[in-house]
């Protein structure tokens, strides 16, 4: 939870593709502005999602969940926590 | 910020060999149904996608990465 | 056109330090794996590292891992190679090479740096 | 890691020979080889990738074959500019080695 508030567009985009849902995908690329030929280089992706099934698209997930919770992941996450609150105390 | 470890694992999938990127999913999800997966997935977007296609996914990447939605 | 430059090579002393730099142009340098490959004196083409687009993965031949470290700007359009702690061994021509997206082929090389490790 | 081997080590031809290099490794690469040029003093030169696919601007007369373990780089009538060294190359995993190299010498 913690990697996607990080970085929400990101994760938006990739479980569009990986969902295989074509509309989703579209709108999540709208909020980048990506160009036509962006677009359909990320179509082509997401139909290798979309060949290879349910359990394809639900392996993948759980890869990406791993990593985005993963300790090289977490320790991240936490140090930029701790390098905000120094920044919202010199802040003040 | 993206967590580096994601974005290895997203750019080994677009430009890594398929060894390289199961290589590093292994580092993860050592599971054989796992790995075997990740090859399949990685195979066929490096069939389907040519260098120009490449050019363009990574370019949504930089989108992504350079948001103010990330 | 596409184009990649090395400069920096020369001659040092064993145990010296030299920094190899290789500009790149006529592409979006960003998007590209670079190598480094060397070819010592009248010998075979080895491959030294590989440096991904946005330097998330680095890989290096046994031979220099530990005393190379290869690193990239890419505002700059430039590649570079620190070699620490040289031995006799690693005197050679050294090319910086790009790694195509779709078929992992060095297609583009520099015209290549040499480097002479000598007391 | 995956050796290379390549053979003939040196080759002695004629303009117009048919000229075949083969090249051998230690585990299966798929199609994740290429095939690379070399004149004295100058950087390699990417002839053929993906095992079989000629590189643009490369002549039709060399051609490449095999996947796995064995493949093959040929010459189909040498030219005098094809006198160089042939170098084969793995691109299935890192470290991403080469073969020795194959001298193309005039007869």
């Known amino acids: 939870v913690k990697m996607a508030e990080t970085c929400p567009i990101f994760y938006d985009v990739f479980f569009a593709v990986a969902n295989g849902n074509e509309l989703l995908l579209d709108l999540s690329l709208t909020k980048v502005n990506a160009t036509e030929p962006e677009r359909t280089a990320m179509k082509k992706i997401q139909d290798c999602y979309v060949e290879n099934g349910l359990i394809s698209r639900v392996l993948d997930g759980l890869v990406m969940t791993t990593i985005s919770s993963s300790k090289d992941c977490m320790g991240e996450a936490v140090q930029n926590t701790v390098e905000d609150l120094k920044l919202n105390t010199l802040g003040r | 910020e993206i967590c580096p470890a994601v974005k290895r694992d997203v750019d080994l999938f677009l430009t890594g060999t398929p060894d390289e990127y199961v290589e590093q999913v292994a580092q993860y999800k050592a599971l054989p149904v796992v790995l075997e997966n990740a090859r399949i997935l990685k195979n066929c977007v490096d069939a389907k996608m040519t260098e120009e296609d490449k050019e363009n996914a990574l370019s949504v990447l930089d989108k992504i990465y350079t948001s103010p939605l990330c | 056109e596409v184009q990649l430059v090395e400069s920096g090579g020369g001659l040092v002393k064993p145990g010296g330090s030299l920094r190899l730099s290789c500009a790149a142009s006529g592409f979006t340098f960003r998007n590209y794996n670079i190598n480094w490959v060397r070819q010592a004196p009248g010998k075979g083409l080895e491959w030294v590292s590989l440096?991904?687009?946005?330097?998330?993965?680095?890989y290096y031949a046994d031979s220099v891992k530990g005393r190379f470290t290869v690193s990239r700007d890419n505002a700059k359009n430039s590649l570079y190679l620190q070699m620490n702690s040289l031995r006799a061994e690693d005197t050679a021509v050294y090319y910086c090479?790009?790694?195509?997206?779709?078929?992992?082929?060095?297609?583009?090389w520099g015209q290549g740096t040499t480097v002479t490790v000598s007391s | 890691d995956i050796q290379l081997t390549q053979s003939p080590s040196f080759l002695s031809a004629s303009v117009g020979d048919r000229v075949t290099i083969t090249c051998w490794a230690s585990?299966?690469?798929?199609?994740?080889l290429a095939w690379y040029q070399q004149k004295p003093g100058k950087a390699p030169k990417l002839l053929i990738y993906?095992?079989?696919t000629l590189q643009s601007g490369v002549p039709s007369r060399f051609s490449g074959s095999g996947s796995g373990t064995e493949f093959t780089l040929t010459i189909s009538s040498l030219q005098p500019e094809d006198f160089a060294t042939y170098y084969c190359q793995q691109l299935n995993s890192y470290p991403f080695t080469f073969g020795p190299g194959t001298k193309v010498d005039i007869k």
């Open positions: 440096i991904s687009g946005s330097s998330s993965y680095i």
């Open positions: 090479a790009r790694r195509t997206l779709s078929y992992y082929v060095m297609d583009v």
């Open positions: 585990q299966g690469i798929s199609s994740y």
């Open positions: 993906s095992a079989s």
